[in-house]
Interface confidence: low
């Protein structure tokens, strides 16, 4: 999906009002310094591409993020403020429902959510020079 035509300010508002709090809740019990941020993005469409990938694509050691509260709110924000996004996700969501069995949060998931927090922070500061 091409995130170029999304309403970035509305997505930013959704992040600041709820998604950010849910990410913090998920990470409760971990220090911000516990994980090094290795994933980055260069502009807002790129950030949303990476956020979408890390949130909804199962990775080795962490297959359980898609049903978390922050993930569901991310999905809703993208569906509302990115034209045509929800249509592209129907098949992916059905496949995910078949695959998912039980919720088990691992250290790998915590690391992944820590990366997501970094991507979202970057998304909110698009004019900031890349480190």
């Amino acid at each position: 999906y091409d995130f170029t035509n999304c309403d970035f300010e509305k997505i930013k508002a959704a992040y600041l009002s709820t998604i950010s709090k849910d990410l913090i809740t998920y990470m409760s019990g971990t220090k911000s310094t516990e994980f090094n941020n290795t994933v980055s993005c260069s502009n807002r469409p790129h950030c949303l591409t990476e956020i979408q990938s890390l949130t909804f694509n199962p990775t080795a050691g962490c297959a359980s993020l898609a049903k978390e509260m922050f993930a569901m709110k991310t999905k809703a924000a993208l569906a509302i403020w990115c034209p045509g996004y929800s249509e592209t996700q129907i098949n992916a969501t059905q496949a995910m429902k078949k695959r998912r069995k039980r919720k088990v949060t691992t250290n790998k998931c915590l690391e992944q959510v820590s990366q997501l927090q970094g991507l979202w922070r970057r998304f909110n500061r698009p004019l900031l020079k890349q480190q």
Partner: antibody, heavy 121, light 112 residues
Framework: EVQLVESGGGLVQPGGSLRLSCAAS????????MTWVRQAPGKGLEWVSS????????YYADSVKGRFTISRDNAKNSLSLQMNSLRAEDTAVYYC??????????????WGQGVLVTVSS | DIVMTQTPLSLSVTPGEPASISCRSS???????????LHWYLQKPGQSPQLLIY???HRASGVPDRFSGSGSDTDFTLKISRVEAEDVGVYYC?????????FGGGTKVEIK
């Protein structure tokens, strides 16, 4: 096989100290929060202390706060409970358990066989 | 602190018959993340406790499907659809919403 094995229990006088150890095997110890639970003779279960996977956060029951210290060594796959200023009411079987943090719903999915601590003069 | 209250204290059940244990918390166990932090354990005679149900209704690995958990907020129930001889022991509920974590007083299940 996932296993937790406690050691270090025994008889100690009131005011004395004891150090319990728990050896973990069969799973990636550093991924999991750990918890000590105790059970006084003929009584129910009582949560004692929990430590998060990277020791970032530590919690204690009010009944042991200031007297007990939980710690872990992820390199050695071991959990410890240092018990000082022991009282008669600390007499119990102490269980080392896996879990107790937000990440696994807090449920304790693996339990050791338990170790008896008797505080008596 | 959250207080957990279990009823009944003891239960005598005929093999093959259903059994039900209630657990009540002094405040809601629903977290803002949508999960309810209530778990059930069984301690068989002479053994360490074992996890049966986590987060209200999820059966732990290896737990027979005759065990089921339900409830919300402050009222929870553990049901055994058909009690077997191996189900005897003391059942405990536990909340891990906030520290200090706390267990119910236990319900002893015996076979008639």
């Amino acid at each position: 096989e996932v296993q937790l094995v406690e050691s270090g229990g025994g008889l100690v006088q009131p005011g004395g100290s004891l150090r319990l150890s728990c050896a973990a095997s069969g799973f990636t110890f550093s991924n999991y929060d750990m918890t000590w639970v105790r059970q006084a003779p003929g009584k129910g279960l009582e949560w004692v202390s929990s430590i998060t996977f990277a020791s970032s956060y530590i919690y204690y029951a009010d009944s042991v706060k200031g007297r007990f210290t939980i710690s872990r060594d992820n390199a050695k796959n071991s959990l410890s409970l240092q018990m000082n200023s022991l009282r008669a009411e600390d007499t119990a079987v102490y269980y080392c358990t896996r879990g107790g943090g937000a990440y696994h719903g807090g449920s304790l999915d693996v339990w050791g066989q338990g170790v008896l601590v008797t505080v008596s003069s | 602190d959250i207080v957990m209250t279990q009823t009944p204290l003891s239960l005598s059940v005929t093999p093959g018959e259903p059994a039900s244990i209630s657990c009540r918390s002094s405040q809601s166990l629903l977290h803002i993340n949508g999960y309810t932090y209530l778990h059930w354990y069984l301690q068989k005679p002479g053994q360490s406790p074992q996890l049966l149900i986590y987060l209200v209704s999820h059966r732990a690995s290896g737990v027979p499907d005759r065990f089921s958990g339900s409830g919300s907020d402050t009222d929870f129930t553990l049901k055994i659809s058909r009690v077997e001889a191996e189900d005897v022991g003391v059942y405990y509920c536990e909340q891990t919403l906030q520290t200090p974590y706390s267990f119910g007083g236990g319900t002893k299940v015996e076979i008639k």
